[in-house]
């Protein structure tokens, strides 16, 4: 039961803070069933849509990526931007809309939508700007550096998934982001159905693990009009390998 009030502040277009709890819920992350705030939730006040600050693609929706809004802009001021459609220019897979990937600088079609989860930690620069957020943060902090030189365990506060130990991702929980286990085959995942819905989650699951993608559960015993449960499932054998 959600007995809380979530107030979405109007100052969402500020640059992301450095460190533990930056950004907002991410594309590679899904809400636990039943815990996604519905649009009409009586406990919630949602402002008119404003750009979300972010530090990496993971913090944006499935149809968004994280970048400076202007080419060559200040890498410290990044927001979630709408994904790029087929045949549009790109620099990495996350820039392309679901069902597409970045090949030779152009978004092209793919028959699988699992690149973002698998490559989220490979490239974090945007438009040629190197924003070593974590390094910059750990140099500035006065907390024990031990926190940042050892990979976060389950429940540790994190900024991005690369802060977490193997098999964990960085996902929102309450008012922080913490390391949680990456989902295994058969575990429930949730696909974001409407744009911006990821901004309402305060509990997130990780993305599906390597070789898995979040798909509708094929259950012949379920009635066709029943709720469509998504689970982590093995990729089809004919999928392409586009990772670099």
């Amino acid at each position: 039961t959600l007995n809380s009030v979530l107030n979405s502040n109007a100052i969402k277009n500020l640059p992301p803070p450095l460190g533990g709890a930056a950004g907002h819920p991410g594309s590679a992350v899904s809400a636990a069933p039943g815990i996604l705030y519905p649009g009409g939730n009586k406990y919630q006040t949602i402002d008119n849509y404003q750009p979300y600050p972010c530090a990496e693609d993971e913090e944006c929706g499935t149809d968004e990526y994280c970048a400076s809004p202007t080419r060559g802009g200040d890498a410290g001021v990044q927001i979630c931007l709408a994904c790029r459609k087929r045949r549009k220019r790109c620099m990495r897979h996350a820039m392309c809309c679901p069902g597409n990937y970045c090949k030779n600088g152009i978004c092209v079609s793919s028959d699988q939508n699992h690149f973002r989860g698998e490559i989220e930690e490979t490239i974090t620069e945007s438009f040629g700007n190197d924003h070593s957020t974590l390094d910059g943060y750990s140099r500035r902090t006065t907390l024990s550096s031990k926190m940042y030189h050892t990979k976060g365990q389950e429940g540790s506060v994190c900024l991005r998934s690369s802060d977490c130990a193997s098999g964990l991702c960085c996902a929102r929980h309450f008012w922080s982001k913490i390391c949680k286990p990456v989902l295994k085959e058969g575990q429930v995942c949730t696909k974001h159905r409407r744009k911006g819905s990821h901004g309402l989650e305060i509990f997130q699951r990780c993305y599906c693990g390597e070789g898995l993608s979040c798909r509708i559960q094929k259950d012949h015993h379920q009635a066709s009009n029943s709720s469509r449960l998504h689970t982590c499932q093995r990729h089809h054998h004919h999928h392409h390998h586009h990772h670099h």
Partner: antibody
Framework: EVQLVESGGGLVQPGGSLRLSCAAS????????ISWVRQAPGKGLEWVAS???????YYPDSVKGRFTISRDNAKNSLYLQMNSLRAEDTAVYYC???????????WGQGTTVTVSS | EIVLTQSPATLSLSPGERATLSCRAS??????????MNWYQQKPGQAPRLLIY???KQGSGIPARFSGSGSGTDFTLTISSLEPEDFAVYYC?????????FGGGTKVEIK
């Protein structure tokens, strides 16, 4: 060293207002969620409010509409504006943050609020 | 909201003895592969201090004699050998759901 220092407590009449402050040091304040937790005399602990690093705010039903949590990252300060105070709001108010894990892992020493006529 | 019930309310023990404190949740506090149960110690006139988070992980600087176990709805805090400074009140707290809630506490006193 991480430090959280609360202030602003005192005696107030029912229906009155009070503003608590929490001065933080020893960590990059703007990055982390920070909360208020209270403890009535001789009683247990109760979560009062939280504000995330991305500036969303959260409250339980017991204080919703009466209390407002806010933060000033430039001043490394957290605030709790308490209006329409009731006798049952009498407590020690602690600010607490989650720096290394999701629990309340660092606490201030608390400030006492007494609501009485 | 999730209700946490701690037992016993008071535990009378001598230094060197083993203390076992229990916390039962009204519903499971497990999710995302984590048990969202924490334990705090509070001495008179002082702020609470985090001992254990995620059911069994030690907080920063916590002595090895403090350990946590359990999953689902039943959790245990164990102090393997009580030191004089361990006599205090201990609270469990869940972070699975909003609002986060605390148990009523267990007072560990000197026998």
């Amino acid at each position: 060293e991480v430090q959280l220092v609360e202030s602003g407590g005192g005696l107030v009449q029912p229906g009155g207002s009070l503003r608590l402050s929490c001065a933080a040091s020893g960590f990059t304040f703007s990055s982390y969620a920070i909360s208020w937790v209270r403890q009535a005399p001789g009683k247990g602990l109760e979560w009062v409010a939280s504000v995330s690093g991305w500036l969303d705010t959260y409250y339980p039903d017991s204080v919703k509409g009466r209390f407002t949590i806010s933060r000033d990252n430039a001043k490394n300060s957290l605030y709790l504006q308490m209006n329409s105070l009731r006798a049952e709001d009498t407590a020690v108010y602690y600010c607490a943050t989650s720096l290394q894990n999701y629990a309340f892992d660092y606490w201030g020493q608390g400030t006492t609020v007494t609501v009485s006529s | 909201e999730i209700v946490l019930t701690q037992s016993p309310a008071t535990l009378s023990l001598s230094p060197g003895e083993r203390a076992t404190l229990s916390c039962r949740a009204s519903e499971s506090v497990d999710d995302f592969g984590i048990s969202f149960m924490n334990w705090y110690q509070q001495k008179p006139g002082q702020a609470p201090r985090l001992l254990i988070y995620a059911a069994s992980k030690q907080g920063s600087g916590i002595p090895a004699r403090f350990s946590g176990s359990g999953s689902g709805t039943d959790f245990t805090l164990t102090i393997s050998s009580l030191e004089p400074e361990d006599f205090a009140v201990y609270y469990c707290q869940q972070s699975k759901e909003v609002p986060p809630t605390f148990g009523g506490g267990t007072k560990v006193e000197i026998k």
